[in-house]
Structure formats: structure tokens, C-alpha cells
């Protein structure tokens, strides 16, 4: 369960990929869509507001009954869209949507490599957003691989302002 | 109970070898960050090498790097740093430690170990 | 790398009074800062995580606030077992930094 409905903290960001490639959302047909793409050097990146909750581990899962503790994020590009995950289309899309938000809006956060991060799906243990085709999908992650694969992580730049509502 | 306790410390020449272990209880060690941090006898705090959870990725800081290795054994919830080539300056307190957060080091470490000293000297 | 920059270095105060302890990171972190408390011999105890977040079973009188790069240790009322040195450090990014510790002493 998620500790509480207020975040913790909240912070300004863009999001990249490892390689460096941009995460940008731009309205089409009155959704928006999500692209992986090279910026060119004078277009400003997209922000994102993530939204840090935390939450209790199921003890069967962790080992460690009430002691641990998840860090869970929700990624809002545009005021009242959230990233979310569609478990069945294996895909991650852009949603209007009134708080609370549903559980397929939150994602695990990972520090998987050394100051890159990873969201794996709250609604979906072993699956993450990942890099696919120049879009974001869903990707299923053995854990019996060494998890460094580098289509699941991401960097995140924060952008020093103090608003948190955005575009 | 969530326990964290160090082992192998001691007195050891300059070019010398020691592994530290870091036997935990009480959680799986493979779903946190683990940390190594030292601290020289009245001084502050120094971070050492840190190991990523479930990926195993592994951290050090420069003035240790290729000649430390931490690693661990998920079979013996136990993690390990293997000191080598010790120097002089290597003399701390050697703490291990563990995140908040399953997964993440965003929120710092919140259980520790009690520390093993490490002397090396001739 | 990040530097933490923390002051002061040590600080003769009584019981009762009100501590306030500051750092500056180098560059900006959000809100990903830890503050610590350590008596000698002993390790580290987490008290506050996340800037502002109290650790579980720490006395409410700690409070923690800042983001970006200037963050601050409030402690409202000491009492006689916070005597101690208390270091900050950043958890935003690798090496995660230590400031170089506040030393509260009796006066």
C-alpha cells in the first residue's frame, strides 16, 4: 500500500534515455503521443513532474515485513496526463486522469546503475518501461539476467524551478 | 530485527590484504543498495563502494578503485570488501550499510553495522 | 563530484536551546538529502531522509527542511542525549557526499 496520498517530494525534470536520446510527448489528434528521438541542440527539452510516494513492502516480497520500503513514482509531462502502463498492449501512454490516480500511473524507481533510474510497473512486478522502436514500451525483465539492460534506463536532469505545475 | 554485523578487521601491513564481510539478518541483502563507508578515527565520513541491488552493479570511490572489490554471497545474506594493496591512509573504521528504500539509494542509509577498525601500518 | 559544505563546524549550546544546523550542496539535488547523528563509537543513526521525511522512531523535536542546494537540521529543544556530531549527506547522485559534520557541545 502507498504511505499516505501526498508525495513526499516532487521535482522538475527532463527525462533521457542511456544513450542520451530525449523523451518527448507532443498532442496529436487530441492525445498525446510519446516519442524517443535526438533533439536538436536548440530545442528545449520536455519537463516532468515525478511525483515521489513511498510505499510498504508486502513482507513475503522483501523479507523483511514492515521494514521495507519502496520509492514509487508517478510522471506527469502535462497538467492531468500521467504516464501509465497497459499491461495487456505492452505499451506506455499518456492518460487524462483525476487523483487518486490508478495504481497502472505508479512505477517502482529503481537506481539500477550508478545515477540512471528504472520504473518498473507497480501493477506488474519484472515488467518496465523500456526503450522500443523509438517509443516507450512495456519490457519484461528476467531477474535471472543481469539487470543493467540498458533499454530500461533512464537519466534524469532536474530543472531547477519551484512551481510544479507545469505547461 | 534488521542486523548488520562486520567482520575481518585488524592490524596489516602497508601493501597488505584484508576481506571485510557484512553478515545481514533479518532482510535479503540482494534487494537493497549495500554501502561500505569509512571513517578515520575523529574524523567525518567517507563513502567507499556500494553495490546495486538486484542488479549487482558495483561503485568506488577513486582513491580505492582496482584495489577494492565488494561483492556478496546471496546464498549467505553476507556482503563482502575485499581490500587490497592497503596503504597508510586506508586506516578507518569501516562501516556497512543499508538504504531505506528497496531498489533505491534516494533516501539514504538507514541501518548500519557497528564498524570494524582496520590498521595498517608497519 | 557533489561537496557538501556544513555549518558550523561545532557549536556550544545548552538544554532547551534551539540548534540549527545548515549545508549547501554544490549543485542543485532536489530534495535527496540524509542527516545523521553519531556518537563517538558508535555508527551513524539516520534521522531524517528525504530532507524533510522522520525517520521512524526519532524524536518529533528533529526536523529537517530545504531543496535544491540549501538544506537545514532544526533540533527545537535539545536535550541532553542529542550531544553529539551530526553530518548531512547527499543522495542524489554518485559518490553520495558527506558534509564535514556539526560537533554539539555543552556549554
Known amino acids: 500500500s502507498i504511505t499516505g496520498i501526498s508525495p513526499i517530494t516532487e521535482s522538475l525534470a527532463s527525462l533521457s534515455t542511456y544513450n542520451d536520446q530525449s523523451i518527448t510527448f507532443a498532442l496529436e489528434d487530441e492525445s498525446y503521443e510519446i516519442y524517443v528521438e535526438d533533439l536538436k541542440k536548440d530545442k528545449k527539452k520536455d519537463k516532468v513532474l515525478l511525483s515521489y510516494y513511498e510505499s510498504q513492502h508486502p513482507s513475503s516480497e522483501s523479507g523483511d515485513g514492515v521494514d521495507g520500503k519502496m520509492l514509487m513514482v508517478t510522471l506527469s509531462p502535462t497538467k492531468d496526463f500521467w504516464l501509465q502502463a497497459n499491461n495487456k498492449e505492452h505499451s506506455v501512454e499518456l492518460h487524462k486522469c483525476e487523483k487518486p490516480l490508478p495504481d497502472q500511473a505508479f512505477f517502482v524507481l529503481h537506481n539500477r546503475s550508478f545515477n540512471c533510474v528504472s520504473f518498473e510497473c507497480k501493477t506488474d512486478p519484472g515488467v518496465f518501461i523500456g526503450v522500443k522502436d523509438n517509443h516507450l514500451a512495456l519490457i519484461k525483465v528476467d531477474y535471472s539476467e543481469n539487470l543493467g539492460s540498458e533499454n530500461i534506463l533512464f537519466k534524469l536532469s532536474e530543472i531547477l524551478e519551484h512551481h510544479h505545475h507545469h505547461h | 530485527e534488521v542486523q548488520l554485523v562486520e567482520s575481518g578487521g585488524g592490524l596489516v601491513q602497508p601493501g597488505g590484504s584484508l576481506r571485510l564481510s557484512c553478515a545481514a539478518s533479518g532482510f535479503t541483502l540482494r534487494s537493497y543498495f549495500m554501502t561500505w563507508v569509512r571513517q578515520v578515527p575523529g574524523k567525518g565520513l567517507e563513502g567507499v563502494s556500494a553495490i546495486s541491488g538486484i542488479s549487482g552493479g558495483t561503485y568506488y570511490t577513486d582513491s580505492v578503485k582496482g584495489r577494492f572489490t565488494i561483492s556478496r554471497d546471496n546464498s549467505k545474506n553476507t556482503l563482502f570488501l575485499q581490500m587490497n594493496s592497503l596503504r597508510a591512509e586506508d586506516t578507518a573504521v569501516y562501516f556497512c550499510?543499508?538504504?531505506?528504500?528497496?531498489?533505491?539509494?534516494?533516501?539514504?542509509?538507514?541501518?548500519w553495522g557497528q564498524g570494524t577498525l582496520v590498521t595498517v601500518s608497519s | 563530484d557533489i561537496q557538501m559544505t556544513q555549518s558550523p563546524s561545532s557549536v556550544s549550546v545548552s538544554v532547551g536551546d534551539r540548534v540549527t544546523i545548515t549545508c549547501r550542496a554544490s549543485?542543485?539535488?532536489?530534495?535527496?538529502l540524509a542527516w545523521y547523528q553519531q556518537k563517538p563509537g558508535k555508527a551513524p543513526k539516520l534521522l531524517i531522509y528525504?530532507?524533510?521525511s522522520l525517520q521512524s522512531g526519532v524524536p518529533s523535536r528533529f526536523s529537517g527542511s530545504g531543496s535544491g542546494t540549501d538544506f537545514t537540521l532544526t533540533i527545537s529543544s535539545l536535550q541532553p542525549e542529542d550531544f553529539a556530531t551530526y553530518y548531512c549527506?547527499?543522495?542524489?547522485?554518485?559518490?553520495?557526499?558527506f558534509g564535514g559534520g556539526t560537533k554539539v557541545e555543552i556549554k
Open positions: 549543485q542543485g539535488i532536489s530534495s535527496w
Open positions: 549527506q547527499q543522495t542524489n547522485s554518485f559518490p553520495l557526499t
Open positions: 550499510a543499508r538504504t531505506v528504500y528497496s531498489s533505491s539509494y534516494y533516501g539514504g542509509f538507514q541501518h
Open positions: 528525504v530532507a524533510s
